[in-house]
Amino acid sequence: SVTVHSSEPEVRIPENNPVKLSCAYSGFSSPRVEWKFDQGDTTRLVCYNNKITASYEDRVTFLPTGITFKSVTREDTGTYTCMVSEEGGNSYGEVKVKLIVLVPPSKPTVNIPSSATIGNRAVLTCSEQDGSPPSEYTWFKDGIVMPTNPKSTRAFSNSSYVLNPTTGELVFDPLSASDTGEYSCEARNGYGTPMTSNAVRMEAVERNVGV
């Protein structure tokens, strides 16, 4: 029987470092090895018939035990499939190796209204583009961490909001007077130093009532 395997199905490596993606196989007399890269809608062939393809040949080398990168970039993050078949036969096996190129978060950008109407919906956003794996976000009000569930802490029990740590969106619905304050957010992805945004003050104002 044929086997195709990697003892490292997930590899995490800081950007600009070398890395090897292992692929061990047995049971093939004349193995033909191909490596495919998948990331979202993108699929690229890295290695075809035991040879690195033109778009990778300057920085990837084929070895009998895997492929080795001289230096990885964030664009290399994705799933690599090692596919082994018998030359002129019908034996086949494959193994997937997930490569996560580690990049620390950059300083997040916030979108916070300087004033918002009490009783209405107010949306605050926080995002950063560099972090790999993608960052999770923590919001602060007047320097105090905002819990995911406002009812879990006395300091925020009068607030009504939904906080999504994955998207960085903070939605007040409805906004109350006590939501006035200085807001900032922190991006962290478990690699490098967590980064904090600028703090922006949001005033919760009464609705203007026409005379």
């Epitope: 003892s7 490292e8 070398p18 292992s22 061990a24 047995s26 035990t65 080795t68 001289k70």
Partner: antibody, heavy 116, light 106 residues
Framework: QVQLVQSGAEVKKPGASVKVSCKAS????????MHWVRQAPGQRLEWMGY????????RYSQKFQGRVTITADTSTSTAYMELSSLRSEDTAVYYC?????????WGQGTLVTVSS | DIQMTQSPSSLSASVGDRVTITCQAS??????IAWYQQKPGKAPKLLIH???TLETGVPSRFSGSGSGTDYTFTISSLQPEDIATYYC????????FGQGTKVEIK
């Protein structure tokens, strides 16, 4: 035939560092990752980390991260394992081992004794 | 990390006896287990990989079986030269050894 020959026994004081070598022959050194495994007296074998000699890429066990450094010299087909901030619990036999998927060939082992 | 629990830690058997050692993984290791023999003062020697594939030159009295999380190593007829400590290694996801089984002659 494949051979992995390690450097001789070492005696070190606590806080010092030790560097063990492993010279490979009988195969293409850059084709296979070289791992280091240790065995303290009466203990199980313990994986420490590896190097891909082709590009110098390394991976370390979390337990040893920050204290172990694995390097390779492709011109002499030799891998090295350096362990710093030694303590008495680091007294062990240290092995290099070639990886196919599992470990198929091993060095003879190097006894490192840490004693004041 | 995958943990490997090997048992027994030691055993004593007579020449010609059937000897069985087990290794249990903390999760499915998809048959990626190897077995090693280590004699005092020597490096481990690979006997079996991928659950049951015998290395070239290893006597047929050694065998391996199992699937999922439970694996067995067997010496069908213990010989004096088999006195050693035996270790399992999972290599499905990184590398973890069992704690070893010391085999002695009664």
């Amino acid at each position: 035939q494949v051979q992995l020959v390690q450097s001789g026994a070492e005696v070190k004081k606590p806080g010092a560092s030790v560097k063990v070598s492993c010279k490979a022959s009988g195969y293409s050194f850059t084709d296979y990752s070289m791992h280091w495994v240790r065995q303290a007296p009466g203990q199980r074998l313990e994986w420490m980390g590896y190097i891909d000699p082709y590009n110098g890429g390394t991976r370390y066990s979390q337990k040893f991260q920050g204290r172990v450094t694995i390097t390779a010299d492709t011109s002499t087909s030799t891998a090295y394992m350096e362990l710093s901030s030694l303590r008495s619990e680091d007294t062990a036999v240290y092995y290099c081992a070639r990886q196919t998927d599992y470990f198929d060939y091993w060095g003879q082992g190097t006894l490192v004794t840490v004693s004041s | 990390d995958i943990q490997m629990t090997q048992s027994p830690s030691s055993l004593s058997a007579s020449v010609g006896d059937r000897v069985t050692i087990t290794c249990q993984a903390s999760q499915d290791i998809n048959n990626y287990i190897a077995w090693y023999q280590q004699k005092p003062g020597k490096a481990p020697k690979l006997l079996i990989h991928y659950t049951s594939t015998l290395e070239t030159g290893v006597p047929s009295r050694f065998s391996g079986s199992g699937s999922g999380t439970d694996y067995t190593f067997t010496i069908s007829s213990l010989q004096p030269e088999d006195i050693a400590t035996y270790y399992c290694l999972q290599y499905d996801n990184l590398w973890t050894f069992g704690q070893g089984t010391k085999v002695e002659i009664k």
